[in-house]
Interface confidence: low
């Protein structure tokens, strides 16, 4: 059998196989050692007994989408049946005091591979026995502690495979410079040691995406905005836009990134090299926000040009083709077009990312202030409590609810939270009454809210001791 017979149904075209060469990966035309690595079809009854105590689940994730040329990383995590875990030696053991359907196990081991390997490798001092090989016959790499790695992972995509020895979790990174744009499929098959052979325990597949567009996400934050995810914001308060570029492999770390904003409110274009920008809308309505991100990213060098004329190229061309890797010695002459002829030279290509959102601007509560605090008359049964009226004003729209959070003087440990609907007239003046149990200093966070906004003010108040003999305190 060949790898492609074992690993996947999808057969990439000859073009795909030729143009998607992954560094360090092998062609799935290679032979698969079925004696050491048996192949079971989906639904084969043997899967049921491939693992003691249940089925192992493999979870495959990636940090897709990947900008073409960057690295994409795949992670596989094995999830064992209940009460099982991998120990420091790579053996699979039962967790202490964990009871599963079979009850508590007397044997601490599910699989004691340490004992197996000591038995089976005794015949040959090198440890390079005929069974310590991958499905294509390549020997296991002898990293320190490799004997504790008891799972074999075979990754398969684009007509190629990659083999890895590991524990219950592995990661593999692939450079996408030669990967066709668009969605691709990654499949992983996992085997476990079984004496001098291997047993399949899990198969998993996941889609990943390679793109020539910079993956851009924008977070929007505005003080007093009640729900930052609904793309509704408040008039007359700045909105902070923060651009997040999805670049987990740091491919663009040394790139100059430009951000070009159009806020849709006739304020023109705003160009910046900063990933954050503030903008205040002064009118209500619906606006179309557009962002274009431009980065000079490492990319393929252009084909060799015709022999250059003696005159020097324009600076802009020189800039476009300048060497990305500053450690690479420059070309012998001063003609930057020669860059394309230098082997392994990295050139730059402009990559773009786009973000568009429709945002709604509405009236909201812009500010809230406590203008007065008044001690209130308290009836005799509650000598320990103090009632305090907070007189509050606000600016902007009229609130429909009030919340008070009473906490310790550091404002960190919440003692009491009360929220209630309110009715306020156009003057936006209201009284909020709250109870304080006992004397001392309290931090009071008071928020006024309506459908779209939530405005906060804080104050520290000092509640005096009550004299039990005269429990009544008159309000001012």
């Amino acid at each position: 059998k060949r790898f492609h017979d074992v690993l996947g149904n999808e057969r990439p075209s000859a073009y795909m196989r030729e143009h998607n060469q992954l560094n360090g990966w092998s062609s799935d035309e290679n032979d698969w050692n079925e004696k050491l690595y048996p192949v079971w079809k989906r639904g084969d009854m043997r899967w049921k007994n491939s693992w003691k105590g249940g089925r192992v689940q493999a979870v495959l994730t990636s940090d897709s989408p990947a900008l073409v040329g960057s690295n994409i990383t795949f992670a596989v995590n094995l999830i064992f049946p209940r009460c099982q875990k991998e120990d420091a030696n790579g053996n699979i053991v039962y967790e202490k005091n964990c009871r599963n359907e079979a009850g508590l196990s007397a044997d601490p081991y599910v699989y004691n591979w340490t004992a197996w390997s000591e038995d089976s490798d005794g015949e040959n001092g090198t440890g390079q026995s005929h069974h310590n090989v991958f499905p294509d016959g390549k020997p296991f790499p002898h990293h320190p502690g490799w004997r504790r790695w008891n799972f074999i992972y075979v990754f398969h995509t684009l007509g190629q495979y990659f083999q890895k020895l590991g524990r219950c979790s592995v990661r593999v990174s692939v450079n996408t410079a030669n990967v066709t744009l668009g969605p691709q499929l990654m499949e992983v098959t996992v085997y476990r040691r079984h004496g001098r052979a291997y047993v399949p325990i899990a198969q998993v597949k996941d889609v990943y995406v390679v793109t020539d567009q910079i993956p851009v996400f924008v977070t929007m934050f505005q003080k007093n905005d009640r729900n930052s995810s609904d793309e509704t914001f408040l008039k007359d308060l700045p909105i902070m836009f923060d651009v997040l570029i999805h670049d987990p492999s740091h491919f663009l770390n040394y790139s100059t990134i430009n951000y070009k904003w159009s806020f849709g409110d006739n304020t023109g274009l705003f160009v910046s090299t900063n990933h954050t920008v503030n903008h205040t809308y002064v009118l209500n309505g619906t606006f179309s926000l557009n962002l274009t991100v431009k980065a000079a990213a490492p990319g393929p060098c252009p084909p060799p040009p015709p022999p250059p004329r003696p005159s020097k190229p324009t600076p802009s061309l020189a800039t476009t083709l300048k060497s990305y890797d500053s450690n690479t010695p420059g070309p012998a002459g001063d003609n930057p077009l020669e860059l394309s002829r230098i082997p392994d030279e990295n050139c730059q290509i402009n990559r773009y990312g786009h973000f568009q959102a429709t945002i709604t601007i509405v009236e909201g509560i812009l500010e809230v202030n406590i203008i007065q605090m008044t001690d209130v008359l308290m009836p005799v049964p509650w000598p320990e409590s103090s009632l305090i009226d907070f007189v509050v004003t606000c600016q902007g729209s009229i609130p429909t609810e009030v919340c008070t959070i009473i906490s310790d003087p550091t404002c960190e440990i919440t003692q009491n939270t009360v929220c209630s609907p309110v009715d306020v007239d156009e003057m936006c003046l209201l009284t909020v009454r709250r109870t304080f149990n006992g004397s001392g200093t309290y931090c009071v966070n008071l928020t006024l809210g309506d459908d779209t906004s939530l405005a906060l003010t804080s104050t520290l108040i000092s509640v005096p001791d009550r004299d039990p003999a005269s429990p009544l305190r008159m309000a001012n």
Partner: antibody, heavy 119, light 111 residues
Framework: QVQLQESGPGLVKPSETLSLTCTVS??????????WSWIRQPPGKGLEWIGY???????TYNPSLKSRVTITRDTSKNQFSLELSSVTAADTAVYYC???????????WGQGTLVTVSS | DIVMTQSPDSLAVSLGERATINCKSS??????????LNWYQQKPGQPPKLLIY???TQGSGVPDRFSGSGSGTDFTLTISSLQAEDVAVYYC?????????FGGGTKVEIK
């Protein structure tokens, strides 16, 4: 101690206007964060909120009765009142006035007064 | 309007036994993570008396045997050990939205 007391005629003719007053003692009806409500309960049935007047004077009515209801207040007497026009037999009920504490719940109720609509 | 539906309509429980009353709202009455749901007890010829507010907070002077639970649209009033004086009609009420609305009531009797 806060107390509420309803007063008004116990019998009203159909198509006429029902008028009730709630006298509050122990607290001013202009004290911040309180609302003063009218709630009714037909004999053997459940409770229905009619409307309330805020400490600030703002009034809110139940939409189902809005066209027929008027709530007013007299801060000098510490009273608030209910008028329900064009009454029918379906308006026969025990009418309660109540205080709504910080918009959470009705914590103080009057004893209620039975108003019968009959000719 | 938010419609409040109580079940059962009536309930007969032996003295000392547990009584459970359910209240369901037509839409969520949670606000800031707090259930704006109150429970009242009404005895014949008397006005309702507050038992529980904010879904689970006991009103002043309410015996510990009364407790409330629930969130969103489903709430429960529990009387852990029924006493003779607990014979009454119990109402739930939402205060999240205007108009405040009450459930139809559950009559609790001694079996």
């Amino acid at each position: 101690q806060v107390q509420l007391q309803e007063s008004g005629p116990g019998l009203v003719k159909p198509s006429e206007t029902l008028s009730l007053t709630c006298t509050v003692s122990g607290i001013s009806i202009t004290t911040g964060n309180y609302r003063w409500s009218w709630i009714r309960q037909p004999p053997g049935k459940g409770l229905e909120w009619i409307g309330y007047i805020y400490y600030s004077g703002t009034i809110t009515y139940n939409p189902s009765l809005k066209s027929r209801v008027t709530i007013t207040r007299d801060t000098s007497k510490n009273q608030f009142s209910l008028e329900l026009s064009s009454v029918t037999a379906a308006d026969t009920a025990v009418y309660y006035c109540a205080r709504d504490l910080t918009h959470w719940y009705f914590d103080v109720w009057g004893q209620g007064t039975l108003v019968t609509v009959s000719s | 309007d938010i419609v409040m539906t109580q079940s059962p309509d009536s309930l007969a429980v032996s003295l000392g036994e547990r009584a459970t009353i359910n209240c369901k709202s037509s839409e969520s009455v949670d606000y800031y993570g707090i259930g704006f749901l109150n429970w009242y007890q009404q005895k014949p010829g008397q006005p309702p008396k507050l038992l529980i507010y904010a879904a689970s907070t006991q009103g002043s002077g309410v015996p510990d045997r009364f407790s409330g639970s629930g969130s969103g649209t489903d709430f429960t009033l529990t009387i852990s050990s029924l006493q003779a004086e607990d014979v009454a009609v119990y109402y739930c009420q939402q205060s999240k939205e205007v108009p405040p609305t009450f459930g139809g009531g559950t009559k609790v009797e001694i079996k």
